[in-house]
C-alpha cells in the first residue's frame, strides 16, 4: 500500500515534509515510521529528519530524532525508522558511567605501566602494569607520578556506543 | 534528569480562564513529549493533555476539547494549558508530565510510561 512507504524509502528531493502520509493500523499497531491517531484509525508518518519510531507501536507522537552534540561526529543520519547515531570524534570517548558527554582519551600511560590497548569512541587507552600484566581503573596519575593504586582492581570495560 | 515545575493554579469563578504553566529544567527538556494530568479531590489521575516535543501535535481527554489548549515555547523550555469555560468539575491539582512519548494507553490512565512529573499546582472552580 502506497501509504505505508516511508520517506526514506525516498530520494531526498521527493522528501517533503509538507503533508504526513496515512494508513491503517494494524491490531491497534502502525508500523516503524509511523505513530497512531488519537482515535486509534490511521497511522501516520513521521517526519524525515525530526522524528522517528523504530517498532510496531501506538505511540500518540513520533520520537524527537537525536542531534548529535559538539564533540560528536553524525554516522549516520535520522531517518523515519531510525534515530540519528552520533560517535565521539577521534581523540575522545563515551563512558559508561557518564554517556552524555565525550571525554578526553589519555595521551599516554602512568609510570611502570604500558599501552595494551588504544583509544577507541567507546574507551580510554588501556594500561597494564609492566611486571604482573594488571589492567589499571581508577582515577589515572599524570604520566610522570608514580602509580600507588592496588593493581589488582578489574578494569571496567566500556561497551556503550553513541 | 529533567525537572518540572507548574505554576498558575488559584480560584476561579465558573465560566472564566486559568492559564497554567509548567517550567521544565534539565538536559535536552525540549526532546520530551509533554502532558497535562488532574486529579480531583478523593478521584485519580485522569489525563488531560499532551503534546508533541514540537508542539504541532496535540491530543486532549474528551471532557476538555474545545475548551482547553495544551501548547509549549521551547525557546523558554515552557509547557501551557489555557482554560476557558471552566466548570466546577474542573477543580482539582494539575501535574505536568514529560516522556518521549505517550502510547494510546495514557488516554485510560497508564501513567506507566511516564519518565518526569511536577509537584501540581491547585485550580479551583468555584462561585
Known amino acids: 500500500e502506497s501509504a505505508l512507504i516511508t520517506q526514506q524509502d525516498l530520494a531526498p528531493q521527493q522528501r517533503a515534509a509538507p503533508q504526513q502520509k496515512r494508513s491503517s493500523p494494524s491490531e491497534g499497531l502502525c508500523p516503524p515510521g509511523h505513530h497512531i491517531s488519537e482515535d486509534g484509525r490511521d497511522c501516520i508518518s513521521c517526519k524525515y529528519g525530526q522524528d522517528y519510531s523504530t517498532h510496531w507501536n501506538d505511540l500518540l507522537f513520533c520520537l524527537r530524532c537525536t542531534r548529535c552534540d559538539s564533540g560528536e561526529v553524525e554516522l549516520s543520519p535520522c531517518t523515519t525508522t531510525r534515530n540519528t547515531v552520533c560517535q565521539c570524534e577521534e581523540g575522545t570517548f563515551r563512558e559508561e558511567d557518564s554517556p552524555e558527554m565525550c571525554r578526553k582519551c589519555r595521551t599516554g600511560c602512568p609510570r611502570g605501566m604500558v599501552k595494551v590497548g588504544d583509544c577507541t569512541p567507546w574507551s580510554d587507552i588501556e594500561c597494564v602494569h609492566k611486571e604482573s600484566g594488571t589492567k589499571h581503573s581508577g582515577e589515572v596519575p599524570a604520566v610522570e607520578e608514580t602509580v600507588t593504586s592496588s593493581p589488582g582492581t578489574p578494569a571496567s570495560p566500556c561497551s556503550l556506543s553513541g | 534528569e529533567v525537572q518540572l515545575l507548574e505554576s498558575g493554579g488559584g480560584l476561579v469563578q465558573p465560566g472564566g480562564s486559568l492559564r497554567l504553566s509548567c517550567a521544565a529544567s534539565?538536559?535536552?527538556?525540549?526532546?520530551?513529549?509533554m502532558s497535562w494530568f488532574r486529579q480531583a479531590p478523593g478521584k485519580g489521575l485522569e489525563f488531560v493533555s499532551a503534546?508533541?516535543?514540537?508542539?504541532?501535535?496535540?491530543v486532549y481527554a474528551d471532557s476538555v476539547k474545545g475548551r482547553f489548549t495544551i501548547s509549549r515555547d521551547n525557546s523558554k523550555n515552557t509547557l501551557y494549558l489555557q482554560m476557558n469555560s471552566l466548570r466546577a468539575e474542573d477543580t482539582a491539582v494539575y501535574y505536568c508530565a514529560a516522556a518521549p512519548s505517550f502510547s494510546r494507553s495514557v488516554l485510560d490512565g497508564n501513567l506507566s510510561q511516564i519518565d518526569y512529573w511536577g509537584q501540581g499546582t491547585l485550580v479551583t472552580v468555584s462561585s
Open positions: 534539565g538536559r535536552a527538556a525540549s526532546d520530551y513529549a
Open positions: 503534546i508533541n516535543w514540537g508542539g504541532e501535535d496535540t
